[in-house]
Amino acid sequence: MQKGDQNPQIAAHVISEASSKTTSVLQWAEKGYYTMSNNLVTLENGKQLTVKRQGLYYIYAQVTFCSNREASSQAPFIASLCLKSPGRFERILLRAANTHSSAKPCGQQSIHLGGVFELQPGASVFVNVTDPSQVSHGTGFTSFGLLKL
Amino acid sequence: MQKGDQNPQIAAHVISEASSKTTSVLQWAEKGYYTMSNNLVTLENGKQLTVKRQGLYYIYAQVTFCSNREASSQAPFIASLCLKSPGRFERILLRAANTHSSAKPCGQQSIHLGGVFELQPGASVFVNVTDPSQVSHGTGFTSFGLLKL
Amino acid sequence: MQKGDQNPQIAAHVISEASSKTTSVLQWAEKGYYTMSNNLVTLENGKQLTVKRQGLYYIYAQVTFCSNREASSQAPFIASLCLKSPGRFERILLRAANTHSSAKPCGQQSIHLGGVFELQPGASVFVNVTDPSQVSHGTGFTSFGLLKL
């Protein structure tokens, strides 16, 4: 239900997409049981959610990954929710870290990030991980979204 | 505060309930510091939250469990947020996985799931876990809820 | 964007602050990319978010910590979201628990808590942890917030 033409609902929920790219930025798709309320929020280049209206947004991401301590770098697996506003540098909004499992061949773990942030028109949010090859893309495991308050 | 008779607030937060049932669907109760905004959302059979109005909802669940790698199956502990819409098959909205701990007798871990989804009138959401006997029911550890945008 | 003078948006997101205090209550600051929508929600004594209006709020916290099983007590690391309403005892709203890692010197883990609760005017929410010295205060790792529905 719309709040009215002047104040429509703005929300998105996108689903992880496996990628052959070596970038640490996760890829997303409008597939499965996704949400894209209207064109006031868009998924750009499969990697970032971009908003057209200024305001407060609750932004969240969930990342499930599978890793093993011996086969990974000593550093933990870190997922970061990042912001790119027009004419500004990228900045980290939220991060979560999980030490790799000792389970073999790998141990699955899930990370959830979420918080309320002010976004400017044209601002984009995206998710970075330390090793995208470890991310789980099975149904429901890894997703990303936002809602405007 | 109500948004108005045409657009009342709709929200719920229910508390986990230990169950002797062998089903993988978690049981919930309106007890402790629970929330049930009005009759536009109801807890049915102690297992599912059912909504009367179509719209976008932020749905979440938190599950704390205690398990041990040696005493559990090789598969990780998985919590799933599932949707049953009238006249449709059940579907998974969100999942999270955590490998069992090596701590003895068991190691506690917490999982959080949350996302924005479109629900139809009469739609129900529920939470499935791989082993309900491992779920922690102490105050605040395991809960389930939603809010309508 | 305000919903109107009678129903302004109320939201906060505050950032963890390392503290020399031995208290188990985490300390927060309005620093970095924080949110404080207006004076209807305030951060008091750097430790609690206090609201002026009654209503339903989605309240969340994220805590990242680094611990080692051998160097910690046998009990898991527990993060608790707590409520103090005027003239009432404190109560636990949400808790999450994670067993300490076997990684050395310590293994990082992240906990996320979130739920919908009715708050009274003057109610305060705060976050307790079993060992504040283990909490990670790097950018984005530990935060706390709420939004009024």
Epitope: S20, C66, A103, P105, C106, Q108, S133, S136, H137 | - | -
Partner: nanobody, 118 residues
Framework: EVQLVESGGGLVQPGGSLRLSCAAS????????MGWFRQAPGKEREFVAE???????LYADSVKGRFTISADNSKNTAYLQMNSLKPEDTAVYYC????????????WGQGTLVTVSS
């Protein structure tokens, strides 16, 4: 899906060596982690070794220092060199392929029997 065909199994004396091969066809080899599992009579299937596409290797504690996993991406083939074999290594050895985020393989070979006996 990936089709996996193992070869190289057989009978060997304790202390001897064998080299298992696994030829992969179908979907691209590179996004998968190739590994070996084994199942001894009356026991559960267990992890033996795997190799990632950055040539990171991982071994079960019971085979460390004795077994070596390798891969030839140009031939879409993975190998398991088994040295200092023991009677307790007797099992059916399965080649497997998993995506990085999955805790268990999605694709399995038919298996090849390795018997260590004097």
């Amino acid at each position: 899906e990936v089709q996996l065909v193992e070869s190289g199994g057989g009978l060997v004396q304790p202390g001897g060596s064998l080299r298992l091969s696994c030829a992969a066809s179908g979907r691209t080899f590179s996004p998968y982690i190739m590994g070996w599992f084994r199942q001894a009579p009356g026991k559960e299937r267990e992890f033996v070794a795997e190799i990632g596409w950055r040539d990171t290797t991982l071994y079960a504690d019971s085979v460390k220092g004795r077994f070596t996993i390798s891969a030839d991406n140009s031939k879409n083939t993975a190998y398991l060199q088994m040295n200092s074999l023991k009677p307790e290594d007797t099992a059916v050895y399965y080649c497997a392929a998993r995506r990085g985020g999955d805790y268990l393989p999605t694709d399995w070979g038919q298996g090849t029997l390795v018997t260590v006996s004097s």
